[in-house]
């Protein structure tokens, strides 16, 4: 009956402010509709970064203005968060919900600490 979600403990964003990680879940049932939400926890505040609902076997589709993209394969979701800056460093938590068919199940990962380092500005060249 358990719904466990696993994600890496730490990820370093690249110089372009992009971070990727895998969110993997152990499904207690055969879900056809899954919702994945990325939450950011910083200073005891929790905000929703992005969310997508997808049908098993189909692609993950975030809203057009979302900073997230992703692909799904079985019980794995590959998430990419773009446009990150140093101030966005924090704990990014993957929440997975098996929306359909009943019963509903929910699982939450322990979070991935994403570190973002703003690139040094290029020195002026004369």
């Amino acid at each position: 009956k358990a719904m466990h979600v696993a994600q890496p403990a730490v990820v370093l964003a690249n110089s372009r402010g992009t971070a990727s990680f895998v969110c993997e879940y152990a499904s207690p049932g055969k879900a056809t509709e899954v919702r994945v939400t990325v939450l950011r926890q910083a200073d005891s505040q929790v905000t929703e970064v992005c969310a997508a609902t997808y049908m098993m076997g189909n692609e993950l589709t975030f809203l057009d203005d979302s900073i997230c993209t992703g692909t799904s394969s079985g019980n794995q979701v590959n998430l990419t968060i773009q446009g990150l800056r140093a101030m966005d460093t924090g704990l990014y938590i993957c929440k997975v919900e098996l929306m359909y068919p009943p019963p509903y199940y929910m699982g939450i990962g322990n979070g991935t600490q994403i570190y973002v380092i703003d690139p040094e500005p290029c020195p002026d060249s004369d």
């Epitope: 358990a2 719904m3 969310a51 509903y104 929910m106």
Partner: antibody, heavy 119, light 108 residues
Framework: QVQLVESGGGVVQPGRSLRLSCAAS????????MHWVRQAPGKGLEWVAV????????YYVDSVKGRFTISRDNSNNTLYLQMNSLRAEDTAVYYC????????????WGQGTLVTVSS | EIVLTQSPGTLSLSPGEGATLSCRAS???????LAWYQQKPGQAPRLLIY???SRATGIPDRFSGSGSGTDFTLTISRLEPEDFAVYYC?????????FGPGTKVDIK
């Protein structure tokens, strides 16, 4: 701040219908699962129904399946519970409650509205 | 359906004493997705604990939650006059979401 205000309760005869409303404010309504929880006089809490996010997915406790319908209007930040074929055992205070980011536990509740089913 | 059983049904204690409330599930459920609520007469319930052990915002640290699997505990270290109320546990790992029958903490 988050506010949930229920309305629509009252006295109704067995077999009749009633619609409850819950007006929500102070948060992004469409980002949360919304629930109805009831409490019969002098009894404990009973979860009744949930509707998620865009309104497509809904679940109910067995005792109200086929009689109650939960719905939401995200443009007006309002939650509804349509109650048909009411029975005496449906008499209760009905609370609307907000699920949380970390799961369907309830950090905010309305004040409740009393539904009395009696002939 | 996960059935929650709470014990004792009633706990008679004096202010300043400690209280231990138990919640037992009929089956193990997802990763300690258990919440505790306090309810006073004529009021809506108030969230105390979620995730079995995390205190909700604004809840004093005399309230603590523990447990895993099927056995969970709410502990009130020193009862204040405002703590006399009914306490409910709730599981939210899977539908239907269920509450325990409640434990009433009253003044001895």
């Amino acid at each position: 701040q988050v506010q949930l205000v229920e309305s629509g309760g009252g006295v109704v005869q067995p077999g009749r219908s009633l619609r409850l409303s819950c007006a929500a404010s102070g948060f992004t309504f469409s980002s949360f699962g919304m629930h109805w929880v009831r409490q019969a006089p002098g009894k404990g809490l009973e979860w009744v129904a949930v509707i998620w996010y865009d309104g497509r997915n809904k679940y109910y406790v067995d005792s109200v399946k086929g009689r109650f319908t939960i719905s939401r209007d995200n443009s007006n930040n309002t939650l509804y519970l349509q109650m048909n074929s009411l029975r005496a055992e449906d008499t209760a205070v009905y609370y609307c409650a907000r699920g949380e980011f970390f799961g369907e536990f309830f950090d905010y509740w309305g004040q409740g509205t009393l539904v009395t089913v009696s002939s | 359906e996960i059935v929650l059983t709470q014990s004792p049904g009633t706990l008679s204690l004096s202010p300043g004493e400690g209280a231990t409330l138990s919640c037992r599930a009929s089956q193990s459920f997802s990763s300690n997705y258990l919440a505790w609520y306090q309810q006073k007469p004529g009021q809506a319930p108030r969230l105390l604990i979620y995730g079995a052990s995390s205190r909700a915002t604004g809840i004093p640290d005399r309230f603590s939650g523990s447990g895993s699997g099927t056995d969970f505990t709410l502990t009130i270290s020193r009862l204040e006059p405002e703590d006399f109320a009914v306490y409910y546990c709730q599981q939210y790992g899977t539908s239907p979401f269920t509450f325990g029958p409640g434990t009433k903490v009253d003044i001895k």
